[in-house]
């Protein structure tokens, strides 16, 4: 016997499907409609045979009941090759629901999405999340997709993009997003953080995560955010391999006064990189290579500092006293 | 273990300069700052200011930014205090104070574990 | 630049007797202050760091406690020994570093 597709937990909070067969059978999706959060994998399936059995143009008003009695509010959906035209159709209905959290992994997209019907209503997410999708359109996919979303998008995060860099020109301003996640996207480097980060695009960016995203300095960083006028009050980049020395030729760049939180773990530093910001409420250098303890000037001011799992702090090596550069915390870095 | 040894007591007369050398063993003198404090006599402790023994870059507290160098020399283990164009004002017992790094769970600092025994300076005419 | 006060200017305690040094900063230091020693002829010695840390080989009668702006250093038991000159020292995460005037530990 093969296990039931879908599987909804005792609260009938979350609802999990799982469609591996090659001719899975869609309507047992239908017991996730309790649901709140709903994941949904399609196993790697094409869904373009979908299309003859959809009229993807229908007026998607004749459904609004229905899905506005939907509880779900988290959805997501993976592991499948997905023409534009259904996705569209598929945004169109959700435009009803009470949908906030949108996660797409490991999807295609294929063909062009089409623009926004003048008396469609938009997507009203407040989160949407991103990882290892890829678009037939390339860099105008964010623009394309944008029109089907209302402008209060508070969280987008892309990950594993096949084209991190947007089309600025045809990219509307998220003037709601206050938290911005391009992380998992190594061949970002500082030059596709500058194509990314479309200047004037995301005035109200407040947490700006780039992990592992081959980012190469601090100052590298501070020269796109300014170059974008992207004034985070957080920022993480950690899991990048960060050098420590800048380049003297390149000039000084003055980070923004709101920046107050700064993560530099996991970033492999053997020292504390010169030209952080002189003042910072949270600074994170822990799991790094630091072998010394950092002298007075070479620390900003931090009201909370972090500097576990450096080998000059670790148990074992030398120390003048006790108690004195020990924490007593090892992390496991 | 570690020691800080100051250069003998100076009598300098008033206009001339002194460089008061303090030689560290027993760590590796790049890895702490070393700090410079004046007392002059019966009077308290006063902080001068600190370099950095990695990059050799000094800092000086706002009463000690003229007249006053801070300077070192790596491959001696010595850190030295330079007093140009002396006035009377400067003689005191001038100290040598090493910085040692205090981290424990967000919480960070510096403290003064090893000092000279101090190097008096005597202006007089 | 912050300034640290020390009081009383002058302590008389007899051997035995607890003694209880203050320190005020002008402005929030956090745990940032250090205890100092100094005896006649001698260089000044560590007792007490980030407030409340005694200092390898300080004897326990010694303690630190405060945060923010007052500190306290507190000798239980005063020895022969401890008659001296004692100064806190703001070490606030960056310079500048102050010292306060000292608090002078004298016989009874």
């Known amino acids: 016997t093969t296990p039931e597709p879908c599987e909804l937990d005792d609260e009938d909070f979350r609802c999990v499907c799982n469609f591996s067969e090659p001719q899975p059978d869609w309507s047992e999706a239908f017991q996730c409609v309790s649901a709140v959060e709903v994941e949904i994998h399609a196993g790697g399936l094409n869904l373009e045979p979908f299309l003859k059995r959809v009229d993807a143009d229908a007026d998607p008003r004749q459904y609004a009941d229905t899905v506005k009695a939907l509880r779900v509010r988290r959805l997501t959906v993976g592991a499948a090759q997905v023409p534009a035209q259904l996705l569209v159709g598929a945004l169109r209905v959700l435009a009803y629901s009470r949908l906030k959290e949108l996660t797409l992994e490991d999807l295609k997209i294929t063909g062009t999405m089409p623009p926004l019907p003048l008396e469609a209503t938009g997507l009203a997410l407040s989160s949407l999340r991103l990882r290892n999708v890829s678009w037939a359109t390339g860099r105008s996919w964010l623009a394309e997709l944008q029109q089907w979303l209302k402008p209060g998008l508070k969280v987008l995060s892309i990950a594993q993009a096949h084209s991190p860099a947007f089309s600025c020109e045809q990219v509307r301003a998220f003037p709601a997003l206050t938290s911005l996640d391009l992380s998992d996207n190594p061949g970002l480097g500082e030059r596709g953080l500058m194509a990314a980060l479309c200047p004037h695009k995301f005035p109200a960016i407040q947490n700006l995560a780039l992990r592992n995203t081959g980012m190469e300095t601090p100052t590298g960083v501070c020269a796109a955010l300014a170059a974008a006028g992207v004034q985070p009050h957080s920022l993480d980049l950690s899991h990048n391999s960060l050098r420590a020395t800048v380049n003297p030729s390149a000039p000084r760049c003055m980070w923004s006064s709101a920046l107050n939180s700064l993560n530099l773990s996991f970033a492999g530093l053997e020292q504390v990189p010169k030209g952080l910001p002189a003042k910072l409420r949270v600074l994170d250098l822990s799991c790094n290579r630091l072998n010394r303890a950092p002298q007075p000037d070479e620390l900003p001011e931090v009201d909370n500092l972090t500097l576990d799992g450096n080998p000059f702090l670790v148990p074992g090596t030398a120390l003048p006293h006790e108690g004195s550069m020990n924490s007593g915390v090892v992390p496991a870095c | 273990q570690v020691q800080l040894v100051q250069s003998g007591h100076e009598v300098k007369q008033p206009g001339a300069s002194v460089k008061v050398s303090c030689k560290a063993s027993?760590?590796?003198?790049?890895?702490?700052?070393m700090n410079w404090v004046k007392q002059a006599p019966g009077q308290g402790l006063e902080w001068m200011g600190w370099?950095?023994?990695?990059?050799?870059?000094?800092t000086y507290a706002d009463d000690f930014k003229q007249r006053f160098v801070f300077s070192m020399d790596t491959s001696a283990s010595t850190a030295y205090l330079q007093i140009s164009s002396l006035k009377a004002e400067d003689m005191a017992m001038y100290y040598c104070?090493?910085?040692?790094?205090?981290?424990?769970?967000?919480?960070?600092?510096?403290?003064?574990?090893?000092w000279g025994q101090g190097t008096m300076v005597t202006v007089s005419s | 630049e912050i300034v640290m006060t020390q009081s009383p200017a002058t302590l008389s305690v007899s051997p035995g007797e607890r003694a209880t040094l203050s320190c005020k900063a002008s402005q929030n230091v956090g745990s940032n202050v250090d205890w100092y020693q100094q005896k006649p002829g001698q260089a000044p010695r560590l007792l007490i760091y980030?407030?409340?840390n005694r200092y390898t080989g300080i004897p326990a009668r010694f303690s630190g406690s405060g945060s923010g702006t007052e500190f306290t250093l507190t000798i239980s038991s005063l020895q022969s020994e401890d008659f001296a000159v004692y100064y806190c020292?703001?070490?606030?995460?960056?310079?500048?570093?102050?010292f306060g005037q000292g608090t002078k530990v004298e016989i009874k």
């Open positions: 020292m703001q070490s606030n995460t960056n310079p500048p570093w102050t």
């Open positions: 104070a090493r910085s040692t790094f205090y981290y424990s769970s967000y919480i960070y600092g510096w403290y003064f574990d090893f």
């Open positions: 370099i950095n023994t990695q990059t050799g870059k000094p």
């Open positions: 980030k407030a409340s």
């Open positions: 027993g760590y590796s003198f790049t890895d702490y700052a």
